[in-house]
């Protein structure tokens, strides 16, 4: 059961001094928004018992495992139902306290009633201030039954509930007709899900036999021990003034637990602390009585004396609940009431015993829940005891439950039951989450949901490059912190897996599912400079750039050249895929366009800072080609060219350019300008005799236009070697006349 206690301070002379405190002994209780546990909640539950609104109650947290409710201004504030909720996940548990007004017309003889399934429950409301009206019984706020005012027996109104079932559980109240609800007697009925002494699904399992008023939990078979008692079967008394599953809490104030009501998880309910009784838990137990509400009788034998907190205190030579066992009878010593092991481990369990005659190895045995008996493999004999060691076969889940150590000698026998919890090592259900990445590190959140049992003691993160067969690197981390995987390779995928462990041997769970995390590509930091550019034609631009000289390798995959045509609102991007490149030829540009040009280094998909932008004006494109070019030899050194003007001219032609080249020759061509653009004929002079020439021409407006078709022609005869071609132009008709 969850270690959760709701304390009510019942010194009611002054409501302002009244307080409720909820204390959790759970590991990590109340830590709030972290991954390990929701906070403790303590509140008044107005769903069934409604009281007039007052100033809001004050909630104060004392550390992580205690919360206190104060600020009650008048007695009516106290009446009703209060609840505390604690524990995490499936263990989340609600503890309920029902408060009755001391001045009510009717008072409960007993507030909490815990009964077994099928039992008859009897609720008894004692008349405190008589009214000659009917008594209405309600269940969970709804009408249930009416008793006539003269049906009281010995000043009590009784409600009998035969054959109760778990749905009958809840808050019951008895109220005089037309009286204030605050004058009601409020009860809490808890119906266990099983018959007496049974627990589990189908109620097939036997309870361990809870001592000292402990109540067997119908779901897990554990004893919910009264305040002031501990152990698997509540067999041990705490020191006076202490409570909690391990006696770890202490009652506040100098008078110990006097005046405090203790409420524990169902099916226990509420009671006074050990050694106290009465409606306000202010009366000490009568002689011969002890325990919570003084419900237990000592009946000490052999000279034992009764302590109202712990029961019989035995004289030397005797032990047992009633001092009925002689020390000659063997006795199991210091057996832990609960042990925890991890699944599939093979633990060693020790069991120590003393007695007269002295126990030997063969006289101590260990019995598993399925009845299997284990014999000890080794015994350590000391002057005052024998300790038997048992090697337990590999544990399975079915081994969870009550085990028993038994010692038998000729002096008698003793046995001690203890609970073994077989825990399943945690296995992550999801892969770890990537928080941030850099070129050489990944920041990972390792905390994921898991199957199996907590608490998580360690988190191991295993990682290695994707598709690698190398050993996994492992880092052990704090469960609540993010992890930074360092010294990784840039631009590399890593397979990352989580492994969780819980405390104890064999607590390491299987590895969780892998996830792929890729390191970043570092940002390119270098800003290039555009060092030069020149036009290689109306649509071609050669660009060169430089980078700052920095130590170390260049971080970059290449360069991006951007040309922005502001007039048309168009951007042209040219990718240069070598980081060593420092020049590029841009072709297919729009002639006559003003471009803004810059260059930047790129790495993966990241762009570095751009160079300062440069402004480049491409020359406009020239006119179309001249039409119908024709060549005619005039002599051994002259050839006449004729043509027609280009069509659809964008403006007046400034000149023509003629290209002359010897057919089949390897030398450079010669360009001759025709500076009178209105002419359609020219004579090329100074040519070599009997030589074949190639001619083509183009017009120029602001820029040079397209070339015409190429024509071939040979000079005549065997004249002298000419100095080189020259030209003479005139109108075509005039040339023909000549």
């Amino acid at each position: 059961a969850v270690d959760l206690t709701l304390l009510a301070n019942l010194r009611l002379t002054d409501p302002q001094r009244f307080f409720l405190t909820c204390v959790s002994g759970e590991a990590g209780a109340g830590r709030g928004s972290d991954a390990w546990g929701p906070p403790l909640l303590l509140e008044k539950d107005d769903r069934i018992v409604r009281t007039p609104p007052g100033p809001p109650l004050r909630l104060a947290r004392n550390g992580s495992h205690q919360v206190t409710l104060r600020g009650f201004s008048k007695p009516s504030d106290l009446v009703g139902v209060f609840s505390c909720v604690g524990g995490a996940g499936a263990r989340r548990t609600r503890v309920i306290y029902v408060h009755n007004s001391p001045g009510a017309h009717l008072l409960p003889d007993k507030v909490t009633h815990t009964v077994n399934k099928g039992d008859t429950a009897v609720l008894s409301a004692r008349v405190h201030k008589e009214k000659q009206t009917d008594v209405i019984w309600k269940s969970n706020g709804s009408y249930f039954y009416t008793l006539d005012w003269h049906e009281a027996q010995d000043g009590r109104f009784l409600l009998q509930l035969p054959n109760v079932q778990p749905p009958s559980s809840g808050i019951y109240s008895a109220t005089y007709l037309e009286a204030s609800p605050l004058g009601s007697a409020f009860f809490r009925l808890i119906v266990r899900g099983c018959g007496a002494g049974r627990w589990g699904p189908g109620c097939t399992k036997e309870c361990p036999g809870c001592l000292h008023g402990g109540v067997c939990h119908d779901h897990d078979g554990e004893c919910v021990c009264p305040p002031g008692f501990t152990g698997t079967r509540c067999e041990q008394a705490c020191r006076e003034g202490r409570f909690g599953q391990s006696c770890q809490e202490q009652c506040p104030g100098i008078s110990g637990c006097r005046g405090l009501t203790f409420c524990l998880p169902d099916p226990y309910g509420c009671s006074c602390g050990s050694g106290w009784r009465g409606s306000q838990c202010q009366e000490a137990c009568a002689p011969g009585h002890f325990g919570a509400d003084c419900r237990l009788q000592c009946q000490c034998q052999n000279g034992g004396t009764c302590d109202r907190f712990s029961g019989c205190v035995c004289p030397s030579g005797w032990h047992g609940v009633h001092c009925e066992k002689s020390d000659r009878i063997p006795q199991i010593l210091n057996m832990a009431s609960e042990l925890e092991f991890n699944l599939e481990t093979m633990p060693r369990i020790n069991c120590a015993a003393a007695g007269n005659p002295f126990p030997v190895r063969g006289s101590i045995e260990l019995r598993k829940p399925d009845g299997t008996v284990l014999l000890s493999t080794k015994a350590i004999v000391e002057p005052e005891k024998t300790t038997a060691e048992f090697e337990v076969p590999r544990l399975v889940l079915a081994d969870s439950g009550f085990w028993e150590c038994r010692v038998s000698t000729s002096g008698g026998q003793d046995s001690r039951r203890f609970k073994v919890n077989v825990k399943v090592p945690p296995v992550p259900l999801a892969a770890p989450r990537l928080l941030t990445k850099q070129s050489r590190q990944l920041v990972v959140s390792p905390l994921v949901s898991f199957s199996g049992d907590g608490p998580i003691s360690t988190v191991r993160l295993h990682y290695r490059p994707q598709d690698s067969t190398m050993d996994w690197s492992t880092i052990v981390v704090d469960p609540s912190e993010n992890v930074t995987l360092m010294n990784l390779r840039p631009k590399t995928g890593y397979s990352v897996r989580v492994q969780l462990s819980r405390p104890g041997e064999g607590g390491e769970g299987a590895w969780g599912p892998p996830t792929l995390m890729t390191t970043d590509c570092p940002e390119p930091l270098l800003q290039p400079w555009l060092e030069g550019w020149h036009v290689e034609g109306t649509d071609r631009l050669r660009v060169s750039w430089s980078l700052p000289l920095v130590p170390g390798p260049l971080v970059g995959d290449g360069f991006l050249l951007r040309l922005w045509d502001g007039t048309r609102g168009q951007e042209r991007r040219e990718n240069v895929s070598s980081p060593q490149a420092r020049t590029a030829l841009l072709t297919g540009l729009t002639p006559g366009t003003h471009y803004q040009l810059d260059v930047q280094l790129y790495h993966c998909t990241l762009l570095g800072p751009a160079s300062p932008p440069a402004h480049v004006l491409l020359p406009p494109s020239g006119p179309p080609a001249p039409r119908h070019l024709h060549a005619q030899a005039l002599s051994d050194s002259e050839i006449q060219l004729t043509w027609k003007h280009p069509e659809a001219l964008p403006g007046p032609i400034s000149k023509y350019v003629v290209e002359v080249q010897v057919a089949g020759g390897a030398g450079d061509p010669l360009w001759i300008d025709v500076d009178r653009p209105e002419e359609t004929s020219t004579i090329i002079r100074g040519l070599n005799a009997s030589t074949r020439y190639l001619f083509r021409m183009r017009a120029s407006i602001q820029g040079l236009g397209d070339w015409s078709n190429t024509v071939e022609e040979s000079t005549l005869g065997n004249g002298l070697q000419a100095e080189g071609p020259v030209q003479e132009s005139r109108a075509a008709e005039e040339g023909l006349d000549q």
């Epitope: 940002e523 930091l525 400079w529 555009l530 060092e531 700052p548 800072p609 751009a610 300062p612």
Partner: antibody, heavy 117, light 107 residues
Framework: EVQLLESGGGLVQPGGSLRLSCAAS????????MAWVRQAPGKGLEWVSV????????FYADSVKGRFTISRDNSKNTLYLQMNSLRAEDTAVYYC??????????WGQGTTVTVSS | DIQMTQSPATLSLSPGERATLSCRAS??????LAWYQQKPGQAPRLLIY???NRATGIPARFSGSGSETDFTLTISSLEPEDFAVYYC?????????FGQGTKLEIK
């Protein structure tokens, strides 16, 4: 020791011209970009102009474009700023700075330019 | 142009205290941000480059953080010589632009 030393500042009338110089020493001048940054009296820093290591590329703030010209002589380890058509708002301390790829890592002590009639 | 806005304009602190100066860009500048310190009558000095890298010779009490549009310069424990004006500057886009400065003065 790495050093930059500005000179050429002074008082000039509106519309007039000045030429600032910045002499570099203690480092290989020709492999660094260089910049001019100014600071008007009581005001913050304002970036003015930059030139590439070879001098092949220059860039200017809009406020000085067409009036100022940045240049360098790598053989003399010197940076220049030719300032024409000066205005009252050009009054400032002018700093030259070495541009490494990540920022301006070396600064001169500055030279004062006052434009007033 | 990218606008750089620094806050606060003036920060009054005592030696030994922690100083946090903020710089915001009007659009993303990635991590291309530098911080400069300027004392009266002196030239600026580069402190931090590329948002978080200390320049040569800068004491470890100076640190920078942030990316995209929001950046912080932190001085973990102020020394008397740290009281000055601090400027941020982006190198992501042209023209390069500075913030208007934060004056760190002794309280």
């Amino acid at each position: 020791e790495v050093q930059l030393l500005e000179s050429g500042g002074g008082l000039v009338q509106p519309g007039g011209s000045l030429r600032l110089s910045c002499a570099a020493s203690g480092f290989t001048f020709s492999i660094y970009g260089m910049a001019w940054v100014r600071q008007a009296p009581g005001k913050g820093l304002e970036w003015v102009s930059v030139i590439s290591p070879s001098g092949g590329q220059t860039f200017y703030a809009d406020s000085v474009k067409g009036r100022f010209t940045i240049s360098r002589d790598n053989s003399k380890n010197t940076l220049y700023l030719q300032m024409n058509s000066l205005r009252a708002e050009d009054t400032a301390v002018y700093y030259c700075a070495r541009v490494y790829y990540y920022g301006m890592d070396v600064w001169g002590q500055g030279t004062t330019v006052t434009v007033s009639s | 142009d990218i606008q750089m806005t620094q806050s606060p304009a003036t920060l009054s602190l005592s030696p030994g205290e922690r100083a946090t100066l903020s710089c915001r860009a009007s659009q993303s500048v990635s991590s291309y941000l530098a911080w400069y310190q300027q004392k009266p009558g002196q030239a600026p000095r580069l402190l931090i480059y590329d948002a978080s890298n200390r320049a040569t010779g800068i004491p470890a009490r100076f640190s920078g953080s942030g990316s995209e549009t929001d950046f912080t310069l932190t001085i973990s424990s102020l020394e008397p010589e740290d009281f000055a004006v601090y400027y941020c500057q982006q190198r992501s886009k042209w023209p390069r632009t500075f913030g208007q400065g934060t004056k760190l003065e002794i309280k």
